[in-house]
Interface confidence: low
């Protein structure tokens, strides 16, 4: 049933999913309904290399979240790569992050009970000018 | 119980939490857990402004949706902004697009059942380098 | 002038524990990620714990996970880590560091040192 | 974790002569490598970061190479305050780990 990438036994501590009294409960449908024609854009895939703020992914991988993988950004360098290819250290690249929805086995291992958490993940990075304070 | 932030009545043609022949369901504890101590983070949010691909934020609801309040980025420029201030249309502000997982309500307006889904948002912009496509 | 000036460090038994400050001065604390090192006796560095601008993002060495905690007040231009159920081989001098990048992420490069303050874990 | 192996483990050269320590990794760090200089009582000194770049205030003679898993920390010309502890430190991969030192002493 759960599409986590996994097969986990019944567990028998885990709670009975036609329990009325279950905490702020919902039922969720995990036949997933694919909003976008395209699910993994070549196009913007390719923006991590000819970015300015260029950035290499990382795989996390967690059995016991849904969805089990998720790719996190990081920033290739400390600076911003200028048109004849070197690092300009007066910029920096920076990751820009969101926050996102997952699902949480809970308790652990649980095959059809969730909960619903909140991850902050770096997408990629973008080139930004650095705080300057100016001394009066 | 649910966190959209309406409250919708009982619809009668919502299916029944306890059926046990509801397809591909789990149980989801909407409490939801942050994992972040801050959920709008600062630096992040100044970015937009000190990128040298620029982006304004979007409000992106529906009430039909949880979250039902997504920021979407729009890049401000095709180019991107140079140290002078001016934009430089040898290079492209490009949004960084990433999928993301939202509950919507199914059969509609029901408050405890939801499908899981799959959009597609635009988190921030970089500034890419364009692909040049050189004729023999 | 940037300065980092840790305190805190002490004698302690096994088991108990410390708090170490942080004291930041002469740059904007809240600009930058702030880091904790520590170094043993005779030993190398070793990286203990980090934190970014906004507490956003925490990361811990395993060898401390579970057991110490860092925070800090960007109101008090202040570091802090909490160590709870100290060990001998907890015994270093601690130095507070300053992340390079003005961007209020980890980058961990280190460019701005405490003198160090001494924790000893002795019974 | 990724392991920094810092060699020689003691290098002994006299001043005015070149200084070359090395750092290699145990998996490709890309260039994500700084070096940091610790003098006896005191508190390290970002030298390097990003494996090439000289942080701020630190002398043209000291420079950073390499990329992937072997890097070089080269002294052009040593200078009596020079001899000190050496060491690399990773950024690629969490958790961030620093190599064993190099002692640099006097002749």
């Known amino acids: 049933i759960v599409k986590a990438g996994i097969a986990i036994p019944r567990n028998s501590g885990c709670p009975n999913s036609e329990d009325k009294n279950f905490p702020r409960t919902v039922m969720v449908n995990l036949n997933i309904h694919n909003r976008n024609t395209s699910t993994n854009p070549k196009r913007s895939s390719d923006y991590y290399n000819r970015s300015t703020s260029p950035w290499n992914l990382h795989r996390n991988e967690d059995p016991e979240r849904y969805p089990s993988v998720i790719w996190e950004a990081k920033c290739r360098h400390l600076g911003c790569v200028k048109a004849d290819g070197n690092v300009d250290y007066h910029m920096n690249s920076v990751p820009i992050q969101q926050e996102i929805l997952v699902l949480r086995r809970e308790p652990r291992h649980c095959p059809n009970s969730f909960r619903l958490e909140k991850i902050l993940v770096s997408v990629g990075c973008t080139c930004v000018t650095p705080i300057v304070h100016h001394v009066a | 119980i649910v966190k959209a932030g309406i409250a919708i009545p009982r619809n009668s043609g919502c299916p029944n939490s306890e059926d046990k022949n509801f397809p591909r369901t789990v149980m989801v504890n909407l409490n939801i857990h942050n994992r972040n101590t801050s959920t709008n983070p600062k630096r992040s949010s100044d970015y937009y402004n000190r990128s040298t691909s620029p982006w304004n934020l979007h409000r992106n609801e529906d009430p039909e949706r949880y979250p039902s309040v997504i920021w979407e980025a729009k890049c401000r420029h095709l180019g991107c902004v140079k140290a002078d201030g001016n934009v430089d249309y040898h290079m492209n502000s490009v949004p960084i697009q990433q999928e993301i997982l939202v509950l919507r309500r199914e059969p509609r307006h029901c408050p405890n059942s939801f499908r899981l889904e799959k959009i597609l948002v635009s988190v921030g912009c970089t500034c890419v380098t364009p692909i040049v496509h050189h004729v023999a | 002038e940037v300065q980092l000036v840790e305190s805190g460090g002490g004698l302690v038994q096994p088991g108990r524990s410390l708090r170490l400050s942080c004291a930041a001065s002469?740059?904007?604390?809240?600009?930058?990620?702030m880091h904790w090192v520590r170094q043993a006796p005779g030993k190398g560095l070793e990286w203990v714990s980090g934190?970014?601008?906004?507490?956003?993002?925490?990361g811990y060495a395993d060898s401390v996970k579970g057991r110490f905690t860092i925070s800090r007040d960007n109101a008090k231009n202040s570091l802090y880590l909490q160590m709870n159920s100290l060990r001998a081989e907890d015994t270093a001098l601690y130095y507070c560091a300053k992340d390079i990048a003005a961007a209020g992420e980890f980058y961990f490069d280190m460019d701005v040192w405490g003198q160090g303050t001494t924790v000893t874990v002795s019974s | 974790e990724i392991v920094l192996t810092q060699s020689p483990a003691t290098l002994s050269l006299s001043p005015g002569e070149r200084a070359t320590l090395s750092c290699r990794a145990s998996q490709s760090v890309s260039s994500y490598l700084a070096w940091y200089q610790q003098k006896p009582g005191q508190a390290p000194r970002l030298l390097i970061y990003?494996?090439?770049n000289r942080a701020t205030g630190i002398p043209a003679r000291f420079s950073g190479s390499g990329s992937g898993t072997d890097f070089t920390l080269t002294i052009s010309s040593l200078e009596p305050e020079d001899f000190a502890v050496y060491y690399c430190q990773q950024r690629s991969n969490w958790p961030p780990t620093f190599g064993q030192g190099t002692k640099l002493e006097i002749k």
């Open positions: 002469g740059f904007t604390f809240d600009d930058f990620a």
């Open positions: 990003d494996a090439s």
């Open positions: 934190i970014n601008w906004n507490s956003g993002s925490i």
